[in-house]
Interface confidence: low
């Protein structure tokens, strides 16, 4: 199991017994747009634009969803596309709230297993490759509404039912209450209210800030872990460099964490995981010898 | 601490719209769904409706003609009318926070307010 | 919509362990969680075993859950049965437009 495979890597263990984000509107600049005698102005912002394909990205990812994961097959796409389009058609950009995203948290209602949810910071790749892997394990994309809207961007006009395909509000140079950044900070919240038992993370030990407390994981997940329902937070520190044994466990940041998780009364264990290439390879094939002794 | 509780008349007639209002504390009916459940002598839980951190509503298919629920976000406070009551709505009637993502589930309930119906 | 039918009683004698099935009607059991709520005369429910099996902290060990596909049903196990165990308790779960449905539930009496 999964802990042979953290015995074969030297893994280190330590037993371990809400900052808001800046809120700010950019107004954006207004640029003309089109030609002839009257132009028509579009809100310029400072992020990259609407995803090429927005509507039929997200309606083709729904379908092959609901095709893999025979559990959602009653959700009906057409009426979650509707729902997501809802949620930014026509209003502005600076202005989303989570209220304008509930009919579509209303569709996208799943059931994962709460005591296998794995959160991520800042090393996405690894931790969809650890769940494809370990497929009883499930992070935020693994659900459907994070399958939909994983590396996508999207917004649109005030008064208008276009899609701005030109620019969208960046978070910290233009508004944080934008059409992404509204969505993640939704479905983080619910999707760590509903963990329970041991909640994993995986941390990317190669950043300054191990633990961001700007992050999604935490500024809000952190926050919304229920505390008479989740028992553990395990922190997984991945290491970048090849030669790197240092114990990332004792990072101060780390040791933040420790402290944020402490005071709601969930208890703290961090692991260090030296070698990514190694874990993913033995939680593939954990018969394999080198994952069940010592290396 | 998180706090439920119901408050209305206890004792209405056949035929009156029965108002109910569900005061919550210690967390934000934007960020929790709402539910209505009624218990009537002598039977098991009732759910009656819910409404969304977004303001929508869903109600029991059963009572969804009699029912209305609203509610005000500035005061905390999650609204029941049931119009052209009977005898057999005589019961309790609570109010309980869920949330969901993957399961719904109360985690908290109001201590229910008793009513009854009489002809 | 599925129903959920549980038995109208159940009795056990103090420090035995006892059983209540929550039987659901149709479509899979492990389809969309079951929640288990405790309810003491002239209380609200509380709830002991939510996402099948897992139990709030402030509730004791002696409360388990659990599905059986076979039987498509969840179970609720209270071993070491205690005088305070007397109550009703109702299971729960939802449809797939989320719709909340409990079954009828079962009177335990210790004996």
């Known amino acids: 199991g999964l802990n042979d495979i953290f015995e074969a890597q030297k893994i280190e263990w330590h037993e371990g017994s809400h900052h808001h984000h800046h809120h700010h509107h950019g107004s954006g600049s207004l640029v003309p747009r089109g030609s002839g005698s009257v132009p028509r102005w579009r809100q310029q912002w400072s992020g990259p634009g609407t995803t090429k394909r927005f509507p039929e990205t997200v309606l083709a990812r729904c379908v092959k969803y609901t095709e893999i994961h025979p559990e959602m097959r009653h959700v009906d796409c057409q009426s979650v596309w509707d729902a997501f389009k809802g949620a930014f058609i026509s209003k502005h950009p600076c202005n989303i709230t989570e209220e304008d995203y509930q009919p579509l948290m209303k569709l996208g209602t799943q059931t994962v297993p709460c005591n296998k949810i794995l959160l991520w910071s800042r090393i996405k790749d690894l931790a969809h490759q650890f769940t494809q892997v370990q497929r009883d394990m499930f992070t935020l994309e693994d659900t459907l509404l994070g399958y939909l809207a994983d590396d996508l961007t999207w917004c649109g006009e005030f008064n208008t039912s276009k899609i701005n395909y030109q620019s969208c509000p960046d978070w910290r140079k233009d508004c944080s209450n934008n059409p992404v950044s509204v969505f993640w900070k939704t479905v983080s919240r619910r999707f760590a209210e509903a963990a329970c038992d041991v909640v994993h993370v995986m941390l990317n030990g190669s950043r300054s800030k191990i633990f961001d407390k700007n992050s999604t994981f935490g500024s809000v997940e952190v926050h919304n872990l229920q505390p008479e329902k989740v028992q553990t937070l395990e922190a997984w520190v991945i290491h970048g460099g090849r030669e790197d044994s240092r114990d990332l466990c004792q990072d101060p940041t780390i040791k933040e964490l420790e402290s944020i998780i402490s005071k709601r009364n969930i208890q703290f264990s961090c692991k260090n995981i030296y070698r990514p290439d190694k874990f993913l390879q033995c939680v593939k094939n954990p018969e394999d010898s080198s994952c069940t002794s010592e290396i | 601490q998180v706090q439920l509780k119901e408050s209305g008349p206890g004792l209405l007639l056949s035929s009156e719209t029965l108002s109910l209002t569900c005061t919550v504390s210690?967390?934000?009916?934007?960020?929790?769904?709402v539910s209505w459940v009624r218990q009537l002598p002598g039977r098991g839980l009732e759910w009656m409706g819910r409404v969304w951190i977004g303001g929508d509503t869903d109600y029991n298919s059963d009572l969804k003609s009699r029912l209305s629920i609203s509610r005000d976000i500035a005061k905390s406070q999650v609204f029941l009318k049931m119009s052209n009551l009977k005898t057999e709505d005589t019961g309790t009637y609570y109010c309980?926070?869920?949330?969901?993502?993957?399961?719904?589930?109360?985690?908290?309930w109001g201590p229910g307010t008793m009513v009854t119906v009489s002809s | 919509q599925f129903t959920l039918t549980q038995p109208k009683s159940v009795s056990g004698s103090l420090r035995s362990t006892i059983t209540i099935p929550c039987e659901r009607s149709?479509?899979?059991?492990?389809?969309?969680?079951v929640t288990w709520y405790q309810q003491h005369l002239g209380r609200p429910p509380l709830n002991v075993i939510y996402?099948?099996?897992?139990?709030p902290s402030e509730v004791s060990d002696r409360f388990s859950g659990s599905i059986d596909s076979s039987s498509n049903s969840a179970s609720l196990t209270i071993t070491n049965l205690q005088m305070d165990d007397e109550a009703d308790y109702f299971c729960q779960s939802y449809d797939s437009n989320t719709d909340i449905i409990f079954g009828g539930g079962t009177k335990v009496t210790v004996l």
């Open positions: 149709s479509g899979d059991i492990g389809d969309n969680y």
């Open positions: 996402a099948d099996d897992q139990r």
């Open positions: 210690g967390f934000s009916l934007t960020s929790y769904e």
């Open positions: 309980a926070r869920a949330y969901g993502f993957n399961y719904w589930s109360f985690d908290f």
